[in-house]
């Protein structure tokens, strides 16, 4: 059932990386507009993106209030010129999203190698601790602040002159690895949340190599 010339949204999909979270849906509107509501399982509905012709809605501000909660959203469809109009059941046409738990489901963004420093036969590789939009006490938390020891990084490294890779892991944002003196190495990192069953790994960081500007060398 529904309102004349109004179709329900479909293919509601959560797109979330490092807690930046957008709900997307179809179809592109023809003579209709949308409003989104979001709620936790036990909470009240909050309306967002009022009467929009977009097919996405940024819900980051809502989900960062408690990233461990499970959220449900719904998208209402209204005739473009008559937003008070309701469906035959006396309420606007709407479609529910899948449930979404940010802590368990947000994709891990591509990490960045912040720096590497060589001291003799050791290299310290530091991964940038990316800021998220999750707040605590009016400050934005980093990815490490949010996930703590649940987040690990895997380092891939190899001599510039050979293809054989090595790997190391850390539950901080720093690696201390052994290298051969006089050899240049390249590095790439990947974020992992071992406790997850989906969205466990990020894409690899851009490769950084010794001899480039990010590095520092000391005897």
């Amino acid at each position: 059932s529904g309102t004349t010339n109004t179709v329900a949204a479909y293919n509601l999909t959560w797109k979330s990386t490092n807690f930046k979270t957008i709900l997307e849906w179809e179809p592109k509107p023809v003579n209709q507009v949308y409003t989104v509501q979001i709620s936790t399982k036990s909470g009240d509905w909050k309306s967002k993106c009022f009467y929009t012709t977009d097919t996405e809605c940024d819900l980051t501000d809502e989900i960062v209030k408690d990233v461990k909660q499970t959220y449900l959203a719904r998208v209402f469809s209204y005739p473009a010129g008559n937003v008070e109009s309701t469906g035959s059941a006396g309420e606007p046409l709407y479609e529910n999203s899948p449930e979404f738990t940010p802590y368990l489901e947000t994709n891990l963004g591509q990490p960045t190698i912040q720096s590497f420093e060589q001291v003799g036969t050791k290299v310290n590789v530091t991964v940038e601790d990316e800021r998220t939009l999750v707040r605590r006490n009016n400050t934005f938390l980093s990815l490490r602040d949010v996930f703590g020891k649940d987040l690990i990084y895997t380092l891939y490294y190899w001599k510039s002159s050979s293809s054989g890779k090595k790997t190391a892991k850390t539950n901080t944002n720093e690696f201390l690895i052994d290298v051969d003196k006089g050899e240049n190495y390249c590095f790439s990192v990947q974020a992992v949340i071992p406790s997850r069953t989906v969205n466990r790994k990020s894409t690899d960081s851009p490769v950084e190599c010794m001899g480039q500007e990010k590095g520092e060398f000391r005897e």
Epitope: K165, A168, K169, V192, P194
Partner: antibody, heavy 117, light 107 residues
Amino acid sequence: QVQLVESGGGVVQPGRSLRLSCKASGFNIKDYYMHWVRQAPGKGLEWIGLIDPENGNTIYDPKFQGRFTISADNSKNTLFLQMDSLRPEDTAVYYCARDNSYYFDYWGQGTPVTVSS
Amino acid sequence: DIQMTQSPSSLSASVGDRVTITCKASQDIRKYLNWYQQKPWKAPKTLIYYATSLADGVPSRFSGSGSGTDYTFTISSLQPEDIATYYCLQHGESPYTFGQGTKLEIT
């Protein structure tokens, strides 16, 4: 449920090649690191190497680098171990294992390889 | 490469005994140390991960301790079903390396 099933083992002559398979079910291999481990008769466990099936990154114990090759077919959810120039000392049971980054949480039943003339 | 020295290579104990196995790494492995149990003709099974954490479904008589280079695995009260070979594994950096194994028998 999660399962790993190895196949492809058998008797092979020294110098020849063999390709082992590890078919995964109950999860997507691209979400995990996947490993090969072997155990010679009456001996301990020996790590061969790993692959990240999502990006194809492979890491080997240097003693296997160049002679053994780990690969994955994500569409078939299957891991492979290509073993070339086989030697009698490669005789072992070969296991694949899933790595949740804390530990190897699932192992296959193992497939035996015998290198003998 | 990191070497893992596991001891003893074999040990015999009675049901109810406290059993201890040690693994020493050639360098700091930052607790990336797991303990595996392997019974004859079976694949290994994880008992302890990250040096001290008990894997899912593993009885509480198994425990692990240690940090840096020195790690210990303990069975607080040996049971008949604990007859197996036990291995440590460091996975902090490649190549991952297993200890030589400890074969546990009941007297």
